[in-house]
């Protein structure tokens, strides 16, 4: 007789003891049920301490089950930030590696003299890539300024060209535009494509801060009650072999997971922005196009510099005065053989498509993550029954469970008949981490259409706090440059998760 | 007006690292490259380095390759010089300069700190 | 590395003489050169750079000249402050090198 055999506790005994907690608590046979808090109040093989014992666990194999969802999601957004990463630094340096391979024979002393300030330019757009608070306008402004200092005093030993003249011819530069369209394309593709790159990497970043985040969220004491009652009151209760209703283990989870649940809204529009700025790294003004070919603009401007440099003299002299010549001085520089270089549209490579294909094709996997939650978790952890019959553990026995599934979200739990969710209190942290995936969104919109959202007066009406964590050494606070120290808003998000490789040693 | 402040003096046994430090105002710190020239007592100057504030790049004359590591802090707008492994001839004093414009030329100088090294 | 070499090492000279001291590369460095003076216990102080522009402050008593490997730095008409230490420098390239230094004494 199957009630009788219930009433001996040997199944309870062998489900407690698994986990590892001590026999000497499990009563031989059914107890009064009185002292339940948690579980219904009939005859019961749980004493308090056992009841105590099963409701910790089962939060704990919650909050389990719900790092484990997270992990995997962070490991697939990581690991996107990664493939990403590594192509669009190994597209920069590249585009270095040729420059320092080349330029020496194409250019001689006009690139060896001026070395360190091509090899500063590359730092440059690899901090900025990185998430540094530099301006990139003007970081490509003041390459160009040095360099046609520099170049200016190589291409004319012959004259004396002390600071203020430099000044003058400072000043005059850009309405002589020595070095033809090189810079003002540069600055055009340049600003786009990296900031295309930087912010679709970043939004990786930040998705993947917001889940690690959000995973850390605790469940709070309702929802350990509601988890209790779902996992090990069948047990308590004699019943071991009922598994949860459907529908009941999504309510309880549902109620849970509330707060969770908001992110949905502002999760989605931070996957849809990203898949759409991949459209930006295709093209002539695309990431791979522009990134990789650095170099190709430098050149350029050098032989328009070198070609135009009797017309841009006469006009420095026009605007500047008559430098005085150096008695000792060599004449004048020889014109070089303009400098020949690899075209200037990179051939893709098929390496970004294939990561583009496979990053959309998983960011849409994970689109609906926070309120398929509940029902995965359910079906994944909860050992539920196949179907709502009446034979599945309703929380008070066997039998069909009734109530209606809850919607999504906290203000749909008002009448969750399995948790007590209190909705006019939203938690702080998710509230923080919606408003993290606010402000990515927005910056990835403002880079969708070429601009840097963090040098626009843009007041992101976020507090500071939550994830703004992944600034990577001084790099969020500095600015750079030599004519302005214009203050800036720092960046709220850097590259999280990816080391810093500045400083290197040269010699 | 620029400005380069440097550490105070300091006393060091052979064997131990000293960490100077060099603290600039009165101009953009990340546009100008900075550099450290030591002067042995009665002796010539030599350049031991360079760094670059913005990026944190750097480029070190080889003899203190394997020994010295410059950085920055650009919250601070200072810039430090650590040798490493002192031995009684790293007795000089540490000057920091900074470049006139982006070529090379130190038109401004920190007071210098006197590094002794003795056992 | 770029050696440079400096001569005299020490000179004496009276207030209104006129004084040059000689720097020569071990190549050609164009004109990029640089002169210091420095007096006991102070810092060195920029006098000339690019081989022959004076640096802002400085007295017009001091001029440079030179280029490729062979630089001069005169002074007109020498003061009694101008007592010190001269180096040359090359700012070519790293890494950056000096003479060893020309001391002006006056008598």
């Known amino acids: 007789d199957p009630a009788s055999k219930s009433r001996s506790c040997g199944e309870v005994r062998q489900i407690y003891g698994a986990k590892g907690f001590s026999l000497s608590d499990v009563p031989q046979a059914e107890i009064s049920g009185e002292h339940l808090r948690i579980c219904p109040q009939g005859y019961t093989c749980c004493t308090s301490e056992m009841e105590e014992n099963l409701a910790n666990r089962s939060h704990a194999e919650l909050e389990t089950a719900l790092r484990d969802s997270s992990r995997v999601l962070q490991a697939m957004l990581a690991t996107q930030l990664r493939s990403f990463d590594d192509h669009f630094q190994h597209l920069l340096n590249d585009s270095e590696r040729t420059l320092q391979a080349t330029f020496p024979g194409a250019f001689g002393e006009l690139y060896t003299q001026n070395a360190r300030a091509f090899r500063d330019l590359y730092s440059e757009l690899r901090l900025y890539y990185r998430g540094a608070n530099l301006h990139l306008e003007e970081t490509l402004a003041e390459f160009w300024a040095r360099l046609l200092e520099r170049l200016f005093k190589q291409l004319h030993p012959q004259l004396l060209l002390p600071d203020d003249y430099l000044d003058c011819l400072g000043k005059q530069a850009e309405a002589l535009r020595p070095f033809g369209e090189a810079p003002r394309e540069l600055r055009l593709r340049a600003t786009r494509a990296f900031v295309a790159a930087r912010s679709f990497v970043q939004g990786l970043g930040v998705a993947s801060d917001v889940v690690r985040k959000v995973a850390q969220v605790p469940l709070g004491p309702e929802c350990s009650r509601a988890v209790m009652k779902l996992v090990y009151c069948a047990h308590c209760l004699g019943v071991p072999g009922a598994r949860p209703c459907p529908d009941y283990c999504r309510n309880v989870l549902k109620g849970c997971l509330a707060n969770q649940a908001d992110l949905d809204a502002e999760w989605r529009n931070l996957l849809d922005s990203m898949v759409l700025i991949t459209d930006k790294f295709w093209g002539t003004s695309g990431v791979e196009s522009v990134i990789g070919s650095v170099h190709t603009w430098l050149a350029e401007a050098i032989n328009a510099l070198q070609d135009n440099r009797d017309t841009l003299t006469a006009k420095v002299i026009q605007g500047c005065g008559n430098p005085k010549v150096n008695p000792q001085g060599p004449g004048p520089e020889e014109k070089r053989r303009r400098g020949k270089l690899a075209p200037r549209e990179r051939p893709p490579s098929g390496t970004l498509e294939k990561l583009v294909s496979e990053a959309k094709a998983q960011l849409r996997d994970v689109q609906d993550f926070w309120i398929s939650l509940p029902g995965t978790l359910c079906s994944e952890k909860m050992a539920l029954s196949t179907a709502s019959d009446d034979r599945c553990w309703n929380g008070m026995a066997r039998g069909r469970y009734l109530p209606e599934v809850m919607g999504d979200g906290l203000a749909n739990q008002i009448n969750n008949p399995e948790v007590e969710v209190d909705i006019t209190k939203p938690d702080m942290t998710i509230r923080q981490q919606i408003m993290q995936l606010k402000i990515m969104t927005n910056r990835l919109r403002s880079a969708y259409n070429g601009n840097d959202v963090d040098f626009q007066d843009a007041s992101d009406d976020g507090s500071g706090s939550g994830s703004g964590d992944g600034c990577l050494d001084d790099l969020c606070s500095r600015k750079v440059s030599r004519k302005s120290s214009s203050s800036r808003t720092p960046l709220t998000h850097a590259l999280p998760g990816l080391s810093e490789q500045e400083g290197q040693k040269t010699s | 007006q620029v400005q380069l402040v440097q550490s105070g003096a300091e006393v060091k046994k052979p064997g131990a690292s000293v960490k100077v430090s060099c603290k600039a105002s009165?101009?953009?710190?990340?546009?100008?490259?900075m550099h450290w020239v030591r002067q042995a007592p009665g002796q010539g100057l030599e350049w031991m380095g360079e760094?670059?504030?913005?990026?944190?790049?750097?480029t070190y004359n080889q003899k203190f390759k394997a020994r010295v590591t410059m950085t920055r802090d650009t919250s601070t707008s200072t810039v430090y010089m650590e040798l490493s492994s002192l031995r009684s001839e790293d007795t000089a004093v540490y000057y920091c300069?900074?470049?006139?414009?982006?070529?090379?030329?130190?038109?401004?100088w920190g007071q210098g700190t006197l590094v002794t090294v003795s056992s | 590395d770029i050696v440079m070499t400096q001569s005299p090492s020490s000179l004496s000279a009276s207030v209104g003489d006129r004084v040059t001291i000689t720097c020569r590369a071990s190549?050609?460095?164009?004109?990029?050169l640089a002169w210091y003076q420095q007096k006991p216990g102070k810092a060195p102080k920029l006098l000339i750079y690019?081989?022959?522009n004076l640096q802002s402050g400085v007295p017009s008593r001091f001029s440079g000249s030179g280029s490729g490997t062979d630089f001069t730095l005169t002074i007109s008409d020498v003061q009694a402050e101008d007592f010190g230490t001269y180096y040359c420098?090359?700012?070519?390239?790293?890494?950056?090198?000096f003479g060893q230094g020309t001391r002006l004494e006056i008598k």
């Open positions: 300069a900074r470049e006139k414009r982006d070529d090379g030329v130190f038109a401004y």
């Open positions: 009165g101009y953009t710190f990340t546009g100008y490259y």
């Open positions: 760094i670059n504030p913005s990026t944190g790049d750097t």
């Open positions: 190549q050609g460095i164009r004109s990029a």
């Open positions: 690019d081989a022959s």
């Open positions: 420098q090359q700012s070519f390239g790293p890494p950056r090198t």
